[in-house]
């Protein structure tokens, strides 16, 4: 049996016997184009492709449409994997989305969606989510039904304002909505009453800017 040399996601890497968390090279579906991603092989059985991570404010998340499309940052630290890759990947198979959150008081919580995909760029990478469970709120902090993605140079929200400019970062803004994990990073003791912070309303309420966030995906049949 020939050894698999290209992987579409971290679940395939895990199943190939590579079970250490770290940076791996993934290949776009139906393409030879490659992308580097962080694979979490420890959480909940492993095989998770990390699509977003915040931890210290070292990376600027107020980026352009093109940057959010292609990805930015470092997979070893803060980064955004890229909307185009995630859209293509989640359009091929059914994926779950896990969002892990940390506050400044040492608490952790998560939201798990049992079906997640992004529409294509022609639909502004609109997010589709169903089946919420977890400890970070009984109501989805990502507005339902899903919104189009907006950035500072591509305003696709439902607000009379430009949410990405007002709140900072690219996100699936509604008007503007109960979450923004790509907002401005604020350090401890400066993280409350913020209009543009890292927000997950149905866990921490309004104006609370979180310490750390991770968004990761895995095939539903893993």
């Amino acid at each position: 049996k020939e050894e698999q040399t290209t992987f579409r996601d971290c679940a395939e890497i895990f199943k190939s016997g590579l079970t250490t968390s770290g940076i791996y090279t993934l290949t776009f579906p139906n393409s030879t184009e490659e992308i580097k991603a962080y694979c979490d092989m420890d959480v909940g059985g492993g095989g998770w492709t990390v699509i977003q991570h915040r931890e210290d404010g070292s990376v600027d998340f107020q980026r352009t449409w093109k940057e959010y499309k292609e990805g930015f940052g470092s997979p070893l630290g803060e980064y955004w994997l890229g909307n185009e890759f995630v859209s293509q990947l989640t359009g091929q198979h059914r994926y779950v989305l896990k969002i892990q959150l940390k506050d400044w008081e040492g608490n952790e919580a998560h939201s798990l969606y049992d079906h997640f995909y992004l529409a294509g760029e022609e639909s502004n990478y609109r997010i589709h989510l169903t089946g919420l469970t977890g400890t970070a709120g009984k109501i989805s902090s990502i507005s339902q039904p899903g919104s189009d993605f907006s950035t500072k140079d591509s305003d696709n929200d439902k607000c009379i304002c430009k949410c990405s400019q007002m709140l900072s970062g690219g996100w699936w803004f509604d008007a503007c909505g109960p979450s923004n994990l790509n907002g401005q990073y604020y350090p401890q003791k400066q993280n409350t009453n913020k209009f543009n912070g890292i927000k997950w309303y149905y866990w921490k309420g309004s104006g609370y800017s979180l310490k750390a966030t991770t968004m990761m995906i895995r095939p539903a049949d893993f």
């Epitope: 007002m166 008007a175 503007c176 912070g197 309303y201």
Partner: nanobody, 129 residues
Framework: EVQLVESGGGLVQPGGSLRLSCAVS????????IGWFRQAPGKEREGVSA????????YYADSVKGRFTISSDNSKNTVYLQMNSLRPEDTAVYYC??????????????????????WGQGTLVTVSS
């Protein structure tokens, strides 16, 4: 740093009146809407009233219409809630909160609670004989 400080709460008899104040610093009222919310023990926080100083428009929950009046003094950067004909069911901790005035959905006039990102610590209003 944005700060909102409520004052004016206390114990009042049914039918009585109170005036709550919300002193705002770190932002100017012209650019923001200020809302009053309340939370009774064991209940969800609910919207009571709100004002957009720039346009002078106001909002009231049905339960307080005709009894409560919201106003603002931009020179003092303060918003007031005049509460008349108070009832025992008005007993709650009252909070003021701020939201950028432009953060409005197309076709809507007011804001969901999750859009208010800056909050005060609250002032207790008790209506009892």
């Amino acid at each position: 740093e944005v700060q909102l400080v409520e004052s004016g709460g206390g114990l009042v008899q049914p039918g009585g009146s109170l005036r709550l104040s919300c002193a705002v610093s770190g932002i100017t009222l012209d650019d923001y809407a200020i809302g009053w919310f309340r939370q009774a023990p064991g209940k969800e926080r609910e919207g009571v009233s709100a004002i957009r100083s720039s346009g002078g428009s106001t909002y009231y929950a049905d339960s307080v219409k005709g009894r409560f009046t919201i106003s603002s003094d931009n020179s003092k950067n303060t918003v007031y809630l005049q509460m008349n004909s108070l009832r025992p069911e008005d007993t709650a901790v009252y909070y003021c909160a701020a939201v950028p005035a432009g953060r409005l959905r197309y076709g809507e006039q007011w804001y969901p609670i999750y859009e208010y990102d800056a909050w005060g610590q609250g002032t207790l209003v008790t209506v009892s004989s």
